[in-house]
């Protein structure tokens, strides 16, 4: 924390400039009066500041600002975002998409993943819900960044918003976002032919049930065994050898590249030996011939 | 430009561990998996394992198994490869390769990290 | 684990003239699952030829390969100066994956 002392009369700061830059830690605490700041950062982001001066410029905000900075001046915080921790961003009321934009630039090559996390879904929060506009500036300016939004966030998202989402954008989704996004992109997508269909509809397949999987290996799609692999295990778990091959086409032979892999591993062993030798991968580890499957859990559930 | 840019050459002590970052650029991270392949000098091409970004899964050559970690950090489109207990034979070229999942060839390969143990 | 062997060890030619690069395996690949690189010294291998056969993004059609089961073979119809460098075969057809000791081939 820096000292509180007194600012010598020669030092009085009467307006944002670049002569601050020669001041000592000390000095821009004592003279730098925090409403001035506050009134002109629009300057502070062309003044070539150390990260220790920056210190006490964030520090002076802060007690001006114990609830959080205004909209005002959180638009010009430039590289005093760096600054900020989660925490402080916590307290912020954002609604403007150029905020949003100005703030994203600056934390473009920092390890600022957290920050930006918190910094989106206050946009969020503060617009009230995950529009067209917002969907477009965070695909534009950070690819990616969707995804770090909470399945509760995700739900906000009209399903007319979806076609705005590109599969670079899910890339970073977990499985508990796919299954947000998953039934509002089928939602938008519905009216689609087959082929234009799977194509829009396959970066949302993480979040598909095992049914809608089963309806697509009725629709010769070649699934790529990158999408196979993506899809929830649960969902892949129940689909016959006949369905994935029907599912993947050409593309089936992947199966044995993979075949280490969840959750194709998985599907093996479920699967009788005799039903996978008829794809002639030599896909190893499923369920012997002559061999009966008892589900347990069945008979538990009927006790 | 589909590109896998790798961290810098390491020295190490034997015992010790390294890890080597592949940060990949140009694709969709998670259509294909990360194979790391090392390369002892003058010697041939040696297959460590794989990770798929998509679900962090792994496999790795049992020659290595215990030893190497292969983890991905999606937010960065970045894939690590961490080998411990580190021997004078681990001496070699570390390579990421990007193979697309579903098949078994490597189309783009990073520039390689030179990892050197010696005493 | 699946062995490749590769002959010859070293194949000394001259520009213009034809190569032959043999890879034989220790039991019998699936086809789809072999491929050929091309390594020069100081740099990253780079993918020639996939799936025994098909050639890769960019490599001249003077690069071939052929084969099944156990033996494989690249062929470079007509040897150009960019072209004397270290090939290795490579099998991805059962765990773990496994490399050719390499062919080198140098200007005679």
């Known amino acids: 924390d820096v000292e509180r002392t007194t600012c010598p009369p020669e030092k009085e700061v009467h307006e944002i400039d670049e002569s601050l830059i020669f001041y000592k830690k000390r000095e821009l605490e004592a003279c730098v009066d925090a409403a001035l700041l506050a009134a002109q950062m629009d300057r502070v982001d062309a003044i070539p500041f150390t990260y220790e001066q920056l210190d006490v410029l964030k520090h002076k905000l802060d007690e001006l600002y114990p609830q959080g900075y205004p909209e005002s001046v959180i638009r010009h915080l430039g590289h005093l975002f760096l600054k900020m921790s989660p925490e402080d961003i916590r307290k912020w009321n954002v609604t403007s998409l150029e905020t949003l934009k100005a703030l994203l630039k600056v934390s473009k090559g920092h390890e600022m993943s957290a920050q930006v996390a918190t910094l989106i879904d206050r946009v969020v929060v503060g617009r009230g819900q995950l529009d067209k506009d917002t969907v477009d500036t965070l695909t534009a300016f950070c690819p990616g960044c969707l995804c770090s939004l909470s399945p509760e966030r995700l739900s906000s998202v009209p399903p007319s918003v979806i076609g705005a989402v590109r599969p670079q954008d899910l890339d970073t989704c977990g499985p508990r976002q796919l299954d947000v996004l998953y039934p509002k992109a089928r939602l938008a997508f519905q009216n689609m032919s087959g082929s234009e269909y799977f194509v829009k509809i396959r970066p949302f397949l993480g979040g598909a049930p095992t049914e809608d999987v089963k309806a697509l290996s009725q629709q010769n799609v070649s699934m790529d065994l990158a999408t196979f692999m993506k899809l929830r295990r649960e969902a892949v778990l129940p689909l016959t050898v006949a369905e994935v091959q029907k599912l993947l086409g050409p593309h089936v032979e992947g199966l044995k590249v993979e075949e280490q892999h969840s959750p194709v591993r998985d599907w093996i062993l479920k699967q009788r030996q005799d039903d996978l030798d008829t794809l002639g991968l030599g896909l190893q580890g499923g369920i012997p011939n002559g061999y009966l499957i008892l589900d347990l859990s069945v008979r538990e559930a009927l006790s | 430009e589909v590109q896998l840019v790798q961290s810098g050459a390491e020295v190490k002590k034997p015992g010790a561990s390294v890890k080597v970052s592949c940060k990949a650029s140009?694709?969709?991270?998670?259509?294909?998996?990360m194979d790391w392949v090392r390369q002892a000098p003058g010697q041939g091409l040696e297959w460590m394992g794989d990770?798929?970004?998509?679900?962090?899964?792994?496999i790795y050559n049992q020659k290595f198994n215990g030893r190497v970690t292969m983890t991905e950090d999606k937010s960065t489109s970045t894939v690590y490869m961490e080998l411990s207990s580190l021997r004078s034979e681990d001496t070699a070229v570390y390579y990421c390769?990007?193979?697309?999942?579903?098949?078994?060839?490597?189309?783009?390969w990073g520039q390689g990290t030179t990892v050197t143990v010696s005493s | 684990e699946i062995v490749l062997t590769q002959s010859p060890a070293t194949l000394s030619l001259s520009p213009g003239e034809r190569a032959t690069l043999s890879c034989s395996a220790s039991?019998?690949?699936?086809?789809?699952?072999l491929s050929w690189y091309q390594q020069k010294p100081g740099s990253s291998p780079r993918l020639l030829i996939y799936?025994?056969?098909n050639l890769a993004s960019g490599i001249p059609a003077r690069f071939s390969g052929s084969g099944s089961g156990t033996d494989y073979t690249l062929t470079i119809s007509s040897l150009e100066p960019e072209d004397f460098a270290v090939y290795y075969c490579?099998?991805?057809?059962?765990?773990?994956?496994?490399f050719g000791g390499g062919t080198k081939v140098e200007i005679k």
């Open positions: 390769a990007r193979r697309r999942i579903g098949t078994g060839y490597f189309d783009v």
């Open positions: 140009g694709y969709t991270f998670t259509d294909y998996n």
């Open positions: 990770i798929n970004p998509s679900t962090g899964g792994t």
């Open positions: 039991s019998s690949v699936i086809s789809s699952y």
């Open positions: 799936r025994t056969s």
């Open positions: 490579h099998q991805w057809s059962s765990f773990p994956y496994t």
